[in-house]
Interface confidence: medium
């Protein structure tokens, strides 16, 4: 028999410093988790301490914080080539800067191979990117060698910005000529890695013949087996076993998110590759585990740039955007609207001829807002100044609700209206009317939404039973601010681009901004 | 498919009632409004009656506004219109419609976007 | 008697545009949003437009719908014989609370 370790990580979304509990920005150090300095040290007593072990990441380094505004991806490359990782999957987040943005920083400054077996590059951009990421690499580990075969969500064209010449197959469709060839090699042990979610990842375990391991991201899955260290509550035990198609039990793993912990898995194989055993649990990366000092120098050295960033003018305001929570929490707000537009923009995706895009709505709670910004400052407005409006380093995510739940939503919103409290909803791309002479659950009257299937966008009354795709804070698709109904009925949930970074990018690309209050919400008193 | 199909029609004398029913099936009932609309012989239609969704707004037209009862049950799936005091005038094709919203107010006035293929009342002596 | 008034017929040849109109006052069409439906014969009405220029999907481009003061009405373009049919408008009415129809317009195909 033969025992490999694999270590991994997935969805770190540019957390390099260590971060609160809840993987926010880190106030008291003694309570902090996470990080690469931290990291590092955990792998390194892992390298010591076992003869075979492979440390991998299932994608989504990038996007998330400041780090990757200001680094845009040459961060990754540097501190995951210091922490000597052995491969790396593709996730949709990679594509975020468009393929520049990835080729540039992180594929050709990379020392350790990156993957995805169902990205097939088309057109003048083939022989440019040829050999800068690979459908699988095969790994010597001692003695022995390992075959990674990487995949990433088909998804990613609405997810993120690929552009025209990436072909995102199925996964499934792509892993298993590539699993194929390598067994042809003569490669017994393969380790799928990727970024598709738990649910793909499950049936790529159950699907893809010569599959022994799966390794996946995406999802932001938390397994555990016994009692959880700290606030996450496991989807399942660690690792999920699989019964793939042919009978042979498959170990599903995945690490939650943002460096939070450290995914340890052990496998044995016998000598035809099978594997015997596997058990583990990933690895909560809190402060009993010190902050190696070298990593943690080199973070201290970069972070000095992100400082500096912080106050340099993104774009001017030429009005008053009013953030105060007496209008975000009771009416239409011109920073709420703001900060939709901002979110909508952020997911332009011209993919099909049919639609003019693939979304035209936002959501956002009131109490998330929660600061203004005074045009009297010559119109500046800096990171910094968003940072103030938007302090929880949260990202504006892709749902999809059937219409019903969207209503419940609305009536949520104003379910309490008047105590100033934050569900109170400001929108894009949609058109709310409420009357609050009615009974709470009863005061949504009209509710009209931009239409995507169209040449000519305009606002359709909201069909109770289609299916629609929304941008929302991941606070909201969690069901914060008690919108339970969201978190229960959402259809499907991909996580997206920072949240001050959605608006900041938006701010530099307008260079002006005045955005107005202009009818999204109103109120009625009408009678039947 | 959504569809609605209309039951309980026929011959009544004056003064007399009738209760017509709407089954729904192939959507979420409870998430609309519903109405009655009558087309008389040979002649136009005319909205009869509308409930919201909850039941909490109702409205009649004044033709039948006192003798008219209309009602859901979202558990059945099912639409009710209580007709009494019959008059010949109410001898008309009665279809079941499904409003594009959930209100019966002005604000969300959309439109009746799914219709039955309707039941006849005939009242004659 | 109807508040919101149709003509009572209209006629067109195959290929040609043909526009039904639809007047009524400030507290129907002159306030509120219109729709009209399209009855074969002897089939139930099928909504056509909605919020006085809105197609639900299925409904062929052919067919649109504009509103101006206290009138509305529908064109129809490449009219053709499967358009043979009775046309009826309809609004809310503020001070009646509901729904009115017009009285409906018989288009011929000639």
């Known amino acids: 028999a033969w025992e490999l370790t694999i270590l991994h990580t997935n969805d770190v979304h540019s957390r390099l410093e260590q971060t609160s509990e809840d993987s926010s920005k880190c106030v008291n150090a003694s309570r902090c988790m996470g990080g690469v300095a931290r990291l590092f040290t955990k792998v390194q007593q892992i390298r010591r301490a076992e003869p075979n072990v492979l440390l991998l990441d299932a994608g989504d380094q990038y996007q998330g914080t400041i780090w990757f505004t200001v680094y845009k991806g040459a961060e990754v490359a540097h501190f995951m080539n210091a922490l000597r990782y052995d491969a790396m999957a593709l996730g949709n987040h990679e594509f975020d800067n468009g393929v520049e943005g990835l080729i540039e920083p992180l594929l050709k400054e990379a020392k350790f191979p990156i993957l995805s077996a169902n990205i097939k590059a088309k057109g003048p951009l083939a022989s440019q990117i040829s050999g800068l990421y690979l459908p699988y690499k095969v790994l010597p580990v001692g003695d022995e060698v390992v075959g990674i075969v990487g995949y990433t969500s088909k998804e990613t064209p609405f997810l993120s910005n690929p552009g025209t010449n990436l072909v995102f197959e199925d996964e499934i469709t792509a892993l298993q000529p590539e699993v194929d060839k390598l067994k042809t090699l003569n490669v017994n042990k393969i380790i799928a890695l990727g970024h598709s979610g738990f649910e793909m990842d499950k049936l790529i375990a159950q699907k893809v013949r010569g599959v022994d391991v799966v390794v996946g991201g995406h999802s932001n899955t938390f397994l555990y087996t016994g009692n959880p260290p700290s606030k996450e509550v496991p989807a399942g035990k660690y690792p999920f076993i699989v019964t793939s198609d042919d009978g042979r039990k498959v170990p599903v793993v995945q690490a939650y998110a943002f460096g939070k912990y450290l995914g340890y898995l052990k496998i044995e194989f016998d000598e035809r590759g099978n594997v015997i055993s596997s058990h583990g649990n990933p690895i909560l990366l809190n402060s009993s585990i010190p902050e190696d000092p070298s990593i943690k120098a080199d973070i201290n050295k970069w972070r000095i740039k992100l400082d500096n960033y912080s106050t340099q003018e993104l774009g001017k305001t030429i009005v008053y955007l009013d953030g105060s929570s007496q209008s975000c929490r009771f009416r239409e707000c011109n920073m709420g609207n703001l900060i939709c537009d901002a979110m909508i923009n952020n997911n332009l995706r011209h993919t099909d001829e049919m639609f003019w895009n693939h979304v035209s709505m936002c959501i956002l709670n009131g109490g998330g807002i929660r600061s203004p910004i005074d045009e009297r400052n010559n119109g500046t407005i800096t990171w910094e100044n968003l940072a103030a409006v938007l302090p929880f380093g949260g990202t504006f995510d892709l749902v999809q609700l059937k219409g019903s739940t969207l209503k419940k939503a609305f009536e949520h919103s104003v379910h309490r209206y008047g105590q100033s409290t934050g569900e109170f909803l400001q929108v894009g791309g949609i058109h709310v009317v409420y009357d609050l002479s009615r009974k709470p659950g009863d005061r949504v009257v009209k509710l009209d939404v931009l239409c995507t299937k169209c040449r000519v966008p305009s606002y359709d009354p909201l069909k109770m039973d289609e299916v629609y795709k929304v941008i929302l804070p991941n606070f909201l698709a969690n069901g914060g601010d008690g919108f339970q109904m969201i978190k229960d009925e959402l259809l499907r949930h991909d996580s997206g681009d920072q949240d001050i970074n959605v608006v900041s990018t938006y701010i530099s690309k307008m260079k002006v901004i005045y955005p107005a209050v202009e009818g999204r919400i109103k109120f009625s008193t009408g009678s039947h | 498919e959504v569809q609605l199909v209309e039951s309980g029609g026929g011959l009544v004398q004056p003064g007399r009632s009738l209760r017509l029913s709407c089954a729904a099936s192939?959507?979420?009932?409870?998430?609309?409004?519903m109405h009655w609309v009558r087309q008389a012989p040979g002649k136009g239609l005319e909205w009869v009656s509308g409930?919201?969704?909850?039941?909490?707004?109702?409205g009649y037209a004044d033709p039948v506004r006192g003798r008219f009862t209309i009602s859901r049950d979202n558990a059945k799936n099912s639409l009710y219109l209580q007709m009494n005091s019959l008059r010949a005038e109410d001898t008309a094709l009665y279809y079941c419609?499904?409003?594009?919203?959930?209100?019966?107010?002005?604000?969300?006035?959309?439109?009746?976007?799914?219709w039955g293929q309707g039941t006849t009342v005939t009242v004659s002596s | 008697q109807t508040v919101v008034t149709q003509e009572p017929s209209a006629s067109g040849t195959p290929g040609q545009r043909v526009t039904i109109s639809c007047s009524g006052s400030?507290?129907?069409?002159?306030?509120?949003?219109v729709n009209w439906y399209q009855q074969l014969p002897g089939t139930a009405p099928k909504l056509l437009i909605y919020?006085?220029?809105q197609r639900p999907s299925g409904v062929p481009d052919r067919f649109s719908g504009s509103k101006s003061g206290i009138s509305a009405s529908l064109a129809i373009s490449g009219l053709q014989s499967e358009d043979e049919a009775d046309y009826y408008c309809?609004?809310?009415?503020?001070?009646?609370?509901?729904?009115?129809f017009g009285g409906g317009t018989k288009l011929t195909v000639l």
């Open positions: 419609a499904k409003d594009m919203g959930w209100e019966l107010l002005k604000t969300s006035y959309y439109g009746m976007d799914v």
């Open positions: 192939g959507l979420t009932f409870d998430d609309y409004a």
């Open positions: 409930i919201s969704w909850n039941s909490n707004s109702i």
């Open positions: 400030s507290s129907n069409i002159g306030g509120n949003t």
């Open positions: 919020s006085n220029n």
């Open positions: 309809a609004a809310w009415d503020d001070s009646l609370n509901g729904r009115v």
